[in-house]
Interface confidence: medium
């Protein structure tokens, strides 16, 4: 079935089409089984199909691929690897795919590949080389710019037998290919910590998401080198303070925009500073709304309108006189 | 009894056609990946190529790409292996194997019994 | 391609012996890997998979191990049937087989 001429409009194949050799050029109008396409937005949908594999048949022409809504459960090595190469592929979308497996070299061959959406799928294990393709200790510079990875933590009972924040961290940092990415989104994903060395190695990051997660500390973390930051999002955690040092690295970023609604943000001696550091800066988007959760007594008070009167410390007593 | 049938090797001369087929029974051969795996004289084990089961996904081995053709028939429970230009290289046994679901993410654990390719002039 | 070696290629044993068989991948491919038996003029049989997991109707004397890119198959106690050419697999990247391994009789 030939791609229609409007960019709005798809055509579709017919199921189990047969498919072309993946040695040759794909045939002009094909369109893979249970897809739709359309030359003339560049487009290819495979949205909903319970596919179970990435075709080898896409059109030449692709720029924007979805494959949402699928079963496609691991994403081998060069699963778009194709020759010629699918040389215009930029957004790939595999959200919501059942992925739990991405190997080393998935997305191999796509020398265009700008943005990743692996959104919604529990993924048990991903390869340190699912980015960079290669074990080299520095590998080709990947051209991805976008790379977004939001709820991809797999169930409790699925997980390796290792650390889910160092399996992400190895694949974003292998082989430093990744130096280009510019927004990178790992929201949702339980996090308790960010390894030390993640944001250091990640120079042209314009735009980082850590929401919805499980952070309690930002302590070992450093923001110093992300000079292009734009906007960081740290809303949903379980942040308790933020310290002087995180402080002045945030202030020092000349882009910054920083987001910290819904934190358990604890309201005594140790908050001094950054109440003080809230109502002089200008980074802090909706800084009204931040609230203490603890001390009791502290609780819904907004941390703008805290004097340093409110935010003393329960006298630490001597091991003589503490209780069980 | 789940079984694969291979059929349609013989003599053929280089530069020569041939097309195999391997008739499927026994499971749902709608549902499964199938492969070709060669075994030349004497030697080892060759994975050839490899169809999902829609068609919609196939990989060949850099020997035979451009060369050899791989297809199926879900309605018929076959599966195809169009072999052209055929050279004395690839004289072998031809096994039909089935796969798993998606990619290559199980073993070949059903095998039919070979049909023999033999490329001479 | 990741690339499969088994080794020794051939080995001599007897009835009862304990055998082993290695098996090499030119980089990691996690478990997936399996063994294969092969008898002159017949077509390989499935004997493990996932490295270490059993097919079903193969006898309990075959063992499979390790994971990564060293990989073992063991015959705890050789019968009169098991002489044969024994193959490895791995199925991470598209299918690639060992040169193969052939037991027979000391």
């Known amino acids: 079935s030939s791609p229609t001429s409007s960019a709005s409009s798809f055509s579709s194949s017919a199921p189990f089409l047969a498919s072309a050799v993946s040695a040759q050029p794909p045939l002009p109008d094909q369109c893979p089984a249970l897809c739709e396409c359309s030359e003339a937005a560049r487009t290819v949908k495979c949205v909903n199909r319970n596919l179970t594999e990435v075709p080898t048949d896409l059109p030449a022409y692709v720029r924007n691929l979805f494959l949402t809504g699928n079963q496609l459960a691991v994403l081998p090595a060069g699963a778009f690897a194709r020759r010629p190469p699918l040389a215009e592929l930029a957004a790939l979308n595999l959200s919501g795919s059942r992925l739990d497996e991405v190997r080393a070299g998935a997305f191999e061959h796509l020398p265009s590949l700008r943005q990743l959406d692996l959104s919604h799928n529990p993924l048990a294990d991903l390869s340190p080389f699912a980015f960079s393709g290669s074990n080299a200790s520095v590998s080709a510079p990947s051209p991805l710019v976008e790379l977004i990875l939001n709820h991809i933590v797999p169930p409790e009972d699925e997980r390796q037998n290792r650390s889910f924040e160092g399996m992400v961290v190895a694949a974003l940092l292998a082989g430093r290919a990744l130096q280009g990415l510019r927004r990178l989104e790992l929201a949702s994903n339980h996090f308790l910590y960010l390894p030390r060395d993640v944001l250091a190695q990640l120079p042209s990051l314009r735009h980082l998401d850590l929401s919805n997660n499980s952070l309690v500390s930002l302590t070992y973390v450093s923001f110093r080198n992300l000079t292009h930051l734009e906007s960081l999002h740290l809303e949903d955690n379980a942040l308790k303070v933020l310290h002087n040092g995180t402080l002045a690295e945030l202030q020092g970023l000349p882009h910054i925009r920083v987001f910290l609604d819904n934190n358990p943000w604890v309201c005594d001696c140790h908050m001094a500073d950054m109440v003080t550091w809230l109502k002089e800066t200008e980074v802090v988007q909706g800084k009204d709304r931040l609230t203490c959760a603890y001390p009791e007594k502290m609780r819904n008070r907004v941390l703008l309108e805290l004097n340093s009167a409110d935010l003393d410390c329960d006298p630490i007593l001597p091991p003589s006189l503490q209780t069980s | 009894e789940v079984q694969l049938v291979e059929s349609g090797g013989g003599l053929v001369q280089p530069g020569g056609s041939l097309r195999l087929s391997c008739a499927a029974s026994g499971f749902t051969f709608s549902s499964r990946s199938m492969n070709w795996v060669r075994q030349a004289p004497g030697r080892g084990l060759e994975w050839v190529s490899y169809?999902?089961?829609?068609?919609?996904?196939?990989y060949y081995v850099d020997s035979v790409k451009g060369r050899f053709t791989i297809s199926r028939d879900n309605a018929k429970n076959s599966l195809y292996l169009q072999m052209n230009t055929l050279r004395d290289e690839d004289t072998a046994v031809y096994y039909c194997a089935r796969g798993g679901v998606r990619y290559f993410d199980h073993p070949l654990d059903v095998w039919g019994k070979g049909t023999t390719v033999t490329v001479s002039s | 391609d990741i690339q499969m070696t088994q080794s020794p290629s051939t080995l001599s044993a007897s009835v009862g012996d304990r055998v082993t068989i290695t098996c090499r991948a030119s980089?990691?491919?996690?478990?997936?890997l399996a063994w294969y038996q092969q008898k002159p003029g017949k077509a390989p049989k499935l004997l493990i998979y996932?490295?270490?997991s059993l097919e079903s109707g193969v006898p309990s004397r075959f063992s499979g191990s390790g994971s990564g890119t060293q990989f073992t198959l063991t015959i705890s106690s050789l019968q009169p049937d098991d002489f044969a050419t024994y193959y490895c697999?791995?199925?991470?990247?598209?299918?690639?087989f060992g040169q193969g391994t052939k037991v027979e009789i000391k």
């Open positions: 697999q791995q199925y991470y990247s598209y299918y690639t």
């Open positions: 169809i999902g089961f829609s068609s919609s996904t196939i």
């Open positions: 980089q990691s491919i996690s478990s997936w």
């Open positions: 996932k490295a270490s």
